[in-house]
């Protein structure tokens, strides 16, 4: 999906008001310095692409985050504020959600969510130069 036409300010507002808090809750008990940020993004559409991928695509060691509250809220925000956010995209993540049997917070998942926090922070500061 091409995130170019999303209403970025509305997505930012949704992140600041609710998604960020859920990410913090998920990471509670973890030191902010515990993980290095290895995933980056260069502009807002790119950030949303990376956020979408890390949130909904299963990775080795972290089967799925799709049932977490921050993921459901992310999907809702994209469904509302990205025109034509593809039905296949949403259907794919729903299929993943159904396959998931139980919530297990692994260290790999914590690392992945830490990366997500970094991507969201970057999304919120689009005018900053890449480090």
């Amino acid at each position: 999906y091409d995130f170019t036409n999303c209403d970025f300010e509305k997505i930012k507002a949704a992140y600041l008001s609710t998604i960020s808090k859920d990410l913090i809750t998920y990471m509670s008990g973890t030191k902010s310095t515990e993980f290095n940020n290895t995933v980056s993004c260069s502009n807002r559409p790119h950030c949303l692409t990376e956020i979408q991928s890390l949130t909904f695509n299963p990775t080795a060691g972290c089967a799925s985050l799709a049932k977490e509250m921050f993921a459901m809220k992310t999907k809702a925000a994209l469904a509302i504020w990205c025109p034509g956010y593809s039905e296949t995209q949403i259907n794919a993540t729903q299929a993943m959600k159904k396959r998931r049997k139980r919530k297990v917070t692994t260290n790999k998942c914590l690392e992945q969510v830490s990366q997500l926090q970094g991507l969201w922070r970057r999304f919120n500061r689009p005018l900053l130069k890449q480090q």
Epitope: T18, M72, K73, A77, C82
Partner: antibody, heavy 120, light 111 residues
Framework: QVQLVQSGAEVKKPGSSVKVSCKAS????????ISWVRQAPGQGLEWLGV????????IYAEKFQGRVTITADTSTSTAYMELSSLRSEDTAVYYC?????????????WGQGTLVTVSS | QSALTQPPSASGSPGQSVTISCTGT?????????VSWYQQHPGKAPKLMIY???KRPSGVPDRFSGSKSGNTASLTVSGLQAEDEADYYC???????????FGGGTKLTVL
């Protein structure tokens, strides 16, 4: 039973406000969108706005911006629609409708409707 | 923010097929696959018949089908039955400024 139950008919004076409630049961209220749609006598359907409690997002149709307020109480699974500065043209049946989860623009469940009559 | 355009009326005999059109623009029907159709009997709430322009919710007879070409969506009712007599409304997602548009409605009469 999956349903939306709305409050009863209202008769209002021009210039006043009306608040209609819509109680959901049988589904997880927060993750769906609850839209409000009205239908004037003998006329078509008109969308007023939507609330998605999961992300605390409320969106209003441009025509009603500033005059309509949609709220939700997740503890009671109830949505509310308040319309202010009423005029005779606001006489209509007001429906709440559930937008499918993440497909907020398809209304797969409707309330029974609430008739609001604006008359002096 | 004008409504989608539907013919005010349509009719057919029992057993026949009838097609109702719904014309929009590239900013709504033409731009997305998010077209839905609702059936409304007098004094009742609308009922979702078609969504995502050609999908049927469970419980809707397969006599109802939807299609889309360019800026126009269509609802076809085949094998007309007396209970199909109702008003039919199309609706489309219209982007993040307008969000939802409805058609003016079509009264379907079964002769």
């Amino acid at each position: 039973q999956v349903q939306l139950v709305q409050s009863g008919a209202e008769v209002k004076k021009p210039g006043s406000s009306v608040k209609v409630s819509c109680k959901a049961s049988g589904f997880t209220f927060g993750s769906y969108g609850i839209s409000w749609v009205r239908q004037a006598p003998g006329q078509g359907l008109e969308w007023l706005g939507v609330i998605v409690p999961l992300v605390g997002v409320t969106i209003y149709a441009e025509k009603f911006q500033g005059r309509v307020t949609i709220t939700a109480d997740t503890s009671t699974s109830t949505a509310y629609m308040e319309l202010s500065s009423l005029r005779s043209e606001d006489t209509a049946v007001y429906y709440c409708a559930r937008g499918q989860e993440y497909f907020y623009w398809y209304f797969d469940l409707w309330g029974q409707g609430t008739l609001v009559t604006v008359s002096s | 923010q004008s409504a989608l355009t539907q013919p005010p009326s349509a009719s057919g005999s029992p057993g026949q097929s009838v097609t109702i059109s719904c014309t929009g623009t590239s900013s709504d029907i033409g731009g997305y696959n998010r077209v839905s159709w609702y059936q409304q009997h007098p004094g009742k709430a609308p009922k979702l018949m078609i969504y995502e322009f050609n999908k049927r919710p469970s419980g809707v007879p397969d006599r109802f089908s939807g299609s889309k070409s360019g800026n126009t969506a269509s609802l076809t009712v085949s094998g007309l039955q007396a209970e199909d007599e109702a008003d039919y409304y199309c609706s489309s997602y219209a982007g993040t400024d307008i969000f939802v548009l409805f058609g003016g409605g079509t009264k379907l009469t079964v002769l």
